[in-house]
């Protein structure tokens, strides 16, 4: 094949090599960019910055090599458009540092940075951690910090992510209240901070205030839906990111629902209770307190992480006719109480008959399973009905 005269030449089915001295100063408008999986760049002393726009449209890129060039700066979001990138070789450039954000979200199997005049500061703590943990082939490179020494020796005692403290109101919060949260951010080299409120939806009207190092958040006219929803404060510095989540407890009165008894492994009278704080429960059977035993007991289902409502069952292990009757669930918390009742019939009473009525017995003269000619009682196979009154 004839030698390629261009700055960048195809290499294999989906690769591109750019090795002609000084031909590039940016990566805009590379030919066939959208299908590239491999990009090799060498001897480009004018290529000094790598930014978000440079790699736009290179969504299939897996291997990127920029070596023996003039690269001085790689933007924290440079690889936003190349989420499949797994090999990154930036050796023998002029990089003094590389932000943790640059590689965040990538699954890099290999990261090569040797031959750069790296400068050790807390901003390279993430890279030191990669070296310690054997990630990305970093340990083999024995990275040096220019003028200082091996990256492995960099002191890191003061290289922490920000520390966050979120103050929530001590007092009880009621539906309709306004709530002020404050996030206090401490640490060196603070860069950005904010709130994540994705779970809140219609739970309150949100107003943000303040900035580093003290962020305010007002949740106005809160609803009971705010319970169990995470309000998250985050902050970033050159070392990394920290997040702290809190929940605001909005008080509201107890409520309860009962449903038709269903036969599972045991019988179950399903219920749902809600309220904040979580209500205390008590069962009544035919108006009297029901003392729970190993045969009749309350069982809760695994609660959903983001709601206060609890679902469960009153479990009845092989109930008989003596368990038929009216079941009432009482729920109470400091803000109110509620009850719901339901009739449950588990079995007909076998002794409810008139002595003058004939005993319901059937004879099976051809019954081969019977060892004697004794009569065999036949169970009533008619399904019984349960009427439900949901309170």
């Amino acid at each position: 094949a004839a030698p390629c005269p261009d700055a960048c030449c195809p290499h294999g089915s989906s690769g591109l090599r750019c090795t002609r001295d000084g031909a590039l100063d940016s990566l805009h408008h590379l030919p066939g960019a959208e299908n590239l999986t491999e990009l090799y760049i060498e001897n480009q002393q004018h290529l000094q910055h790598l930014e978000l726009r440079d790699l736009r449209g290179l969504g299939e890129l897996r291997n990127l090599t920029i070596v023996k060039s003039g690269l001085r700066f790689v933007a924290p979001d440079a690889f936003h458009f190349t989420p499949r990138l797994s090999r990154l070789n930036l050796s023998f450039n002029a990089l003094e540092s590389l932000s943790w954000k640059t590689v965040q979200g990538l699954s890099l199997q290999e990261l090569v940075l040797s031959g750069n005049p790296l400068h050790c500061s807390c901003a390279l703590r993430w890279l030191q951690r990669w070296e310690e943990e054997g990630l990305g082939g970093v340990p083999e490179q024995k990275l040096q910090c220019h003028g200082q020494g091996p990256l492995a020796h960099m002191p890191n005692a003061s290289c922490g992510v920000p520390t966050l403290k979120v103050q929530v109101p001590n007092a009880s919060v009621d539906v309709g209240d306004d709530v002020l949260l404050r996030c206090q951010v401490e640490g060196r080299g603070l860069e950005q901070a904010g709130w994540i409120l994705t779970e809140l939806e219609q739970s309150a009207t949100v107003m943000k205030s303040g900035g580093l190092p003290s962020l305010g958040l007002t949740l106005a006219n809160v609803t009971s839906d705010l319970n169990r929803k995470n309000v998250t404060c985050w902050a970033e510095n050159d070392v990394g990111r920290a997040e702290v989540s809190v929940q605001v407890n909005v008080s509201f009165p107890a409520s309860v629902q009962l449903h038709t008894a269903v036969e599972m492994h045991h019988w179950c009278i399903p219920f749902s209770v809600d309220g904040q704080p979580a209500p205390s429960l008590r069962w009544l059977f035919n108006g009297s307190v029901l003392n729970e035993t190993s045969f009749i007991f309350t069982e809760f289902l695994e609660p959903a992480a983001n709601e206060t409502v609890r679902h469960g069952c009153l479990r009845l292990n092989q109930p008989t006719h003596v368990n038929n009757g009216n079941y009432t669930l009482l729920a109470a918390n400091p803000f109110g109480q509620a009850s719901a009742s339901i009739m449950a019939a588990f079995m007909d009473n076998p002794f409810e008959f008139n002595p003058e009525d004939p005993i319901p017995v059937s004879f099976s003269p051809v019954d081969t399973n019977s060892t004697s000619g004794d009569p065999v009682e036949k169970k009533d196979e008619t399904p019984f009905g349960v009427s439900v009154a949901v309170g």
């Epitope: 040096q144 200082q148 020494g149 003061s158 290289c159 080299g189």
Partner: antibody, heavy 119, light 106 residues
């Protein structure tokens, strides 16, 4: 023990060059970066540049770029700093200092070399 | 370049006094160094990465701080402590020094 011994005082004319030496002993010379710092009379400390004797890698403060040359001779464990196009404001005490990466600081300093630039 | 501002530029104190020197960086730094220099002598390392004592440095010297604000404290000033003290950062190139604080006898 670790020692850095510098060459003696120099008097130079403006426009001339000066070459200061720094002989290291008591440690492996090629393992640690050697830095050069200067101090004008009655003034504070000013970083000039650094050399890695293991491979001659260098870095300089922008201010001295193009005017300072850092070299080393591994056979004698000696680092050199040459400053050209001297001006009167280059009159200062020039120090070499080792960056000790085990504890991450400039732990040992030479005794200093006084360079006077005067017509 | 990161600028290092020391205060005060000079102070007079008596033996036994507690002395505090502050150093402020123009932007947040990872750690700080302190040096002591006596007339005609090379700087002597006192404190490395913010709070660790250099070899042979008496325990009356201590360093603290984070971000942009750092402090060198001499808990009980001794006759041999009268000197000029410099702070130095190396969070980014080039390493830069404070202007110095001269501690004189009152």
């Amino acid at each position: 023990q670790v020692q850095l011994v510098q060459s003696g005082a120099e008097v130079k004319k403006p426009g001339a060059s000066v070459k200061v030496s720094c002989k290291a002993s008591g440690y492996t010379f090629t393992t640690y970066w050697m830095h050069w710092v200067r101090q004008a009379p009655g003034q504070g400390l000013e970083w000039i540049g650094t050399i890695y004797p293991g491979n001659s890698d260098t870095s300089f403060a922008q201010k001295f770029q193009g005017r300072v040359t850092l070299t080393r001779d591994t056979s004698t464990s000696t680092a050199y700093m040459e400053l050209s196009s001297l001006r009167s404001e280059d009159t200062a005490v020039y120090y070499c200092t080792r960056f000790y990466f085990e504890d991450w600081y400039f732990d040992v300093w030479g005794q200093g070399t006084t360079v006077t630039v005067s017509s | 370049d990161i600028q290092m501002t020391q205060s005060p530029s000079s102070l007079s104190a008596s033996v036994g006094d507690r002395v505090t020197i502050t150093c402020r960086a123009s932007s947040s730094i990872s750690w700080l160094y302190w040096f002591q220099q006596k007339p005609g002598k090379a700087p002597k390392p006192l404190i490395y990465y913010t709070s660790s004592l250099g070899s042979g440095v008496p325990s009356r010297f201590s360093g603290s701080g984070s971000g942009t604000d750092y402090t060198l404290t001499i808990s009980s000033l001794q006759p041999e402590d009268f000197a000029t003290y410099y702070c130095q950062q190396w969070h980014s190139y080039p390493p830069t020094f404070g202007g110095g604080t001269k501690v004189e006898i009152k």
